[in-house]
């Protein structure tokens, strides 16, 4: 669909006359008649097919046409077509005289025609006029054509319907040769797509309108990159949605269970060393002189019975003192001014002398300790018992009752979680408190280094003066490629160079 | 495909007792810890047990101390929860969850959960 539009500029009749020869009285008052239709080697009368339109008077004999496009549309002439433009046409411009007002072609004499002209051509869409003159013995007709497309019609022949929107049904203006351009921030084959924000994750994030970024289920962030962890996840992250991943010094579902508290909490006092000793609970080290969970009491010098051989201990603002009993001296009451003679040795022990029986020394028996035998020995005290296993005396002798999963006399033994054997292909098996843990071989890799994986043996570069290294997964070896002139495994001898000949 | 699914939920008079069951399927299941929690409607979800991958490490929260039971068969894949002297404050969906380790550190794949109603 289109519009042939012709633009009449001058008409020339000088001396006023009509075809026939004979003059207007008083003067030619000239119109116009045009006919428009399809191409004809030879223009011959017949239907105007692509259309037709009159003038009204426009001037009389000799006269300069104005352009009248504003003013009603009678200059340039529009003759409209609702088809494809053929490329080609045939134009019959007439100037005739009306006597009177009534320019019907029945109303006028049959020798009212001034002058007419004919041409044909090829004629392509376009904006730019083209410019004509046809001129006669007695008359000069100027004028200009083209052909335009009508409003939301494109193409070189004017056969594209593209009508530009801005609604749900598409974002776009129309490109001359009528395919769509969208309007920035749209895109697809009718520009109903909204481009995302930059950045917007392709899977997690979609959108509604341009530069938006709306999450999927279970992300976040302004990229709808960021997973959501499961509710109620304290000291964790994820990696996909509604996971939680504790954070080192953390563990429980829900990572809210202090694993480090002796980090996140310091409670041992005075310089103690904390032990982490499970989910929330800690043992304080105290250092000589302090007591308590936390060590914050400060022990009195004298509770740790400094005074030997029944001394009696004294506090003191710088220490302490021993009051020795009769026959002890020294700073703890570690020497005796007794002998074997005076039978020292309590609860059975056996009296050595020494120093030429200036001094004596108690070999006691068992159960029983001290310089003189005197103190019954607790076996528990030295903490026997490995792993938070509980010590137990039993009389003469003592047992440990192991925590889960240790065992042995002192609890020392882990219970082995590797005992059966569990490392496929030669995996070294490693026992944890949170389970077993297989280091794999070469080769192979999984949870129980089940999985054969291929070896990269050429990851040392082993093949020299630059040959080609291949892994061959049959055997997990490398094989070199020699380049001309070397040969070897590893391509790292040099071969002969063939002999230079004179010619 | 990862799948934890529960039953043994329903509604159980106060003082009553419940069985609930997880059975654990595509994954090595004696590999990883299983533990329980769970969520009564407009509050946090909490956890109640859980136990290691080899069944000697087995926590509960306070709230549950001496009144439920975690235990698991490996053969069976199959984790339970033994509830007994059941409060109407242990009315909840009951989910299973597993970390994905041997040890009781996280979630990583959750069930559909089972509703326990105590109510007289």
């Known amino acids: 669909s289109g519009v042939f539009q012709l633009q009449l500029q001058e008409f020339v009749n000088e001396r006023g006359v009509l075809a026939s020869g004979r003059p207007c009285e008083p003067g030619c008052r000239t119109f116009f008649r045009v006919c428009l239709k399809h191409f004809q080697a030879v223009v011959s009368p017949g239907p105007c097919t692509f259309g037709s339109v009159s003038t009204p008077v426009l001037g009389t004999n000799s006269f300069a046409v104005r352009d009248d496009s504003s003013g009603g549309g009678r200059n340039p002439l529009q003759l409209p077509f609702n088809f494809t433009w053929p490329g080609t046409f045939s134009l019959i411009i007439e100037a005739w005289h009306a006597p009177g007002d009534d320019l019907r072609p029945e109303a006028l004499p049959p020798d009212a025609l001034i002058s007419k002209i004919a041409i044909q051509g090829s004629l392509a869409v376009g904006q730019n006029w083209l410019l004509d003159e046809q001129t006669s013995t007695l008359t000069r007709l100027r004028y200009s054509y083209r052909v335009i497309c009508s409003d939301n019609y494109y193409g070189d022949n004017c056969s594209r319907l593209c009508k530009k929107r801005n609604d749900h049904f598409g974002h776009y203006v129309c490109q001359p040769d009528g395919n769509l351009s969208c309007l920035p921030g749209w895109t697809g084959e009718y520009c109903q797509q909204p481009i995302c924000l930059s950045g917007c994750h392709e899977q997690n994030g979609y959108c509604s309108k341009p530069a938006e970024c709306l999450c999927r289920p279970g992300w976040q962030g302004r990229l709808c990159n960021e997973c959501i962890p499961h509710n109620g996840c304290r000291h964790g992250t994820c990696s996909t949605p509604w996971q939680c991943t504790c954070d080192e010094g953390w563990g429980g579902l829900f990572c809210d269970q202090d694993l480090n508290y002796c980090t996140h909490h310091s409670p041992c006092k005075n310089g103690a060393t904390c032990s982490n000793s499970g989910q929330r609970s800690y043992t304080c080290t105290c250092r000589p002189g302090y007591t308590g969970v936390d060590c914050e009491l400060e022990l009195s010098e004298c509770d740790s019975n400094p005074c030997r051989n029944g001394g009696s201990c004294k506090d003191q603002e710088d220490g302490y003192h021993c009051l020795c009993p009769p026959g002890y001296y020294g700073l703890h009451c570690e020497h005796s001014t007794l002998s074997c003679a005076d039978s020292p040795c309590f609860n059975g022990g056996s009296c050595r002398e020494r120093n030429q029986g200036a001094s004596y020394a108690c070999e006691c028996p068992p159960n029983f300790t001290g310089s003189n035998c005197e103190k019954k020995v607790d076996r528990c005290t030295s903490n026997p018992c490995a792993n938070g296993g509980q010590c137990l005396n039993r009389g003469p002798s003592r047992m440990c009752r192991c925590r889960p999963g240790f065992t042995g006399t002192y609890c020392e033994r882990h219970v082995s979680d590797c005992a059966r054997n569990p490392c496929a292909h030669g995996g070294t098996c490693h026992d944890l408190e949170s389970g077993l843990m297989c280091t794999c071989p070469a080769g192979f890799s999984g949870r129980r280094c089940e999985v054969r994986t291929s070896i990269d043996a050429c990851a040392s570069s082993p093949c020299f003066n630059r040959a080609t290294c291949y892994t061959d997964l049959s055997t997990d070896t490398f094989v070199c490629n020699c380049p001309y002139g070397f040969v070897g495994s590893r391509c790292e001898f040099p071969v002969g160079l063939p002999p230079s000949f004179p010619w | 495909e990862v799948q934890l699914v529960e039953s043994g939920g329903g509604l159980v008079q106060p003082g009553g007792s419940l069985r609930l069951s997880c059975a654990a399927s595509g994954f090595t299941f004696d590999d990883y810890a299983i533990g329980w929690f769970r969520q009564a409607p407009g509050k946090e979800p909490e956890e109640i047990s859980c136990?290691?991958?080899?069944?000697?490490?087995?926590y509960y929260a306070d709230s549950v101390k001496g009144r439920f039971t975690i235990s698991r068969d490996n053969a069976k894949n199959t984790v339970y929860l033994q509830m007994n002297s059941l409060k109407p404050e242990d009315t909840a969906v009951y989910y299973c969850a597993t970390p994905g380790i041997a040890a009781c550190r996280g979630i990583h794949y959750t069930g559909q959960g089972t509703q326990v109603t105590v109510s007289s």
């Open positions: 136990i290691s991958s080899s069944g000697g490490i087995t």
